[in-house]
Amino acid sequence: MNGRVDYLVTEEEINLTRGPSGLGFNIVGGTDQQYVSNDSGIYVSRIKENGAAALDGRLQEGDKILSVNGQDLKNLLHQDAVDLFRNAGYAVSLRVQHRL
């Protein structure tokens, strides 16, 4: 199972409004769990059905999240990244990298 990054990417700014059940997605990654070769970034691992992200439709499983509300996600431990999302407020701006 090789997570080597060798694909074309595009970036997008996605603005989500936290719904009744939150933002509605899961993440993996961080400096303590490298899901992609030579990359400790934060990736979307699951979009929850009927959650805010799913209803918006732009965020996809496998996307890399570069920043949250302008805060860079580089060099974060996994739990620190989780906490950043959980404390991001009602309106959440995500800078994401999609695979093409």
């Epitope: 933002l23 509605g24 993996v28 929850k48």
Partner: nanobody
Framework: QVQLVESGGGLVQAGGSLRLSCAAS????????MGWFRQAPGKERELVST????????????????HYADSVKGRFTISRDDAKNTVYLQMDSLKPEDTAFYYC??????????????????WGQGTQVTVS
């Protein structure tokens, strides 16, 4: 997207052994935990055992942390074959109270939402274990 297929269930006498298998196919990127649950007739589904999946440099590695319900500690052993994307549950010294449908489940990462627990995202159809 993700399929989990259990096998290995059956009828066994008390004191006997069975080995359950759960093969994962489809998307495996982001899989962080695999677990076994069981549900006996008229009872709630309960956790049996889990194994965390270690990712290093884009690959899964063996040696993930394991957890067992008190009722199966010392009798059941969970393991994972990374190459086959399969998790196993070796069940020894089986007791009649182990009779249940056994389900495999997979979790993909951590929820970013406080109010949503880190529940399991995908489930298999289950395999029946009967201990007489």
């Amino acid at each position: 997207q993700v399929q989990l297929v259990e096998s290995g269930g059956g009828l066994v006498q008390a004191g006997g052994s069975l080995r359950l298998s759960c093969a994962a196919s489809g998307r495996t990127f982001g899989m962080s935990t695999m677990g076994w649950f069981r549900q006996a007739p008229g009872k709630e589904r309960e956790l049996v055992s889990t194994i965390s999946i270690i990712w290093r440099d884009g690959r899964t590695q063996s040696g993930g942390r394991t957890h067992y319900a008190d009722s199966v500690k010392g009798r059941f052993t969970i393991s994972r074959d990374d190459a086959k994307n399969t998790v196993y549950l070796q069940m020894d010294s089986l007791k009649p109270e182990d009779t249940a449908f056994y389900y495999c489940a997979a979790r993909f990462g951590s929820s970013v939402d406080v109010i949503i627990p880190d529940d399991y995202d995908y489930w298999g159809q289950g395999t029946q274990v009967t201990v007489s």
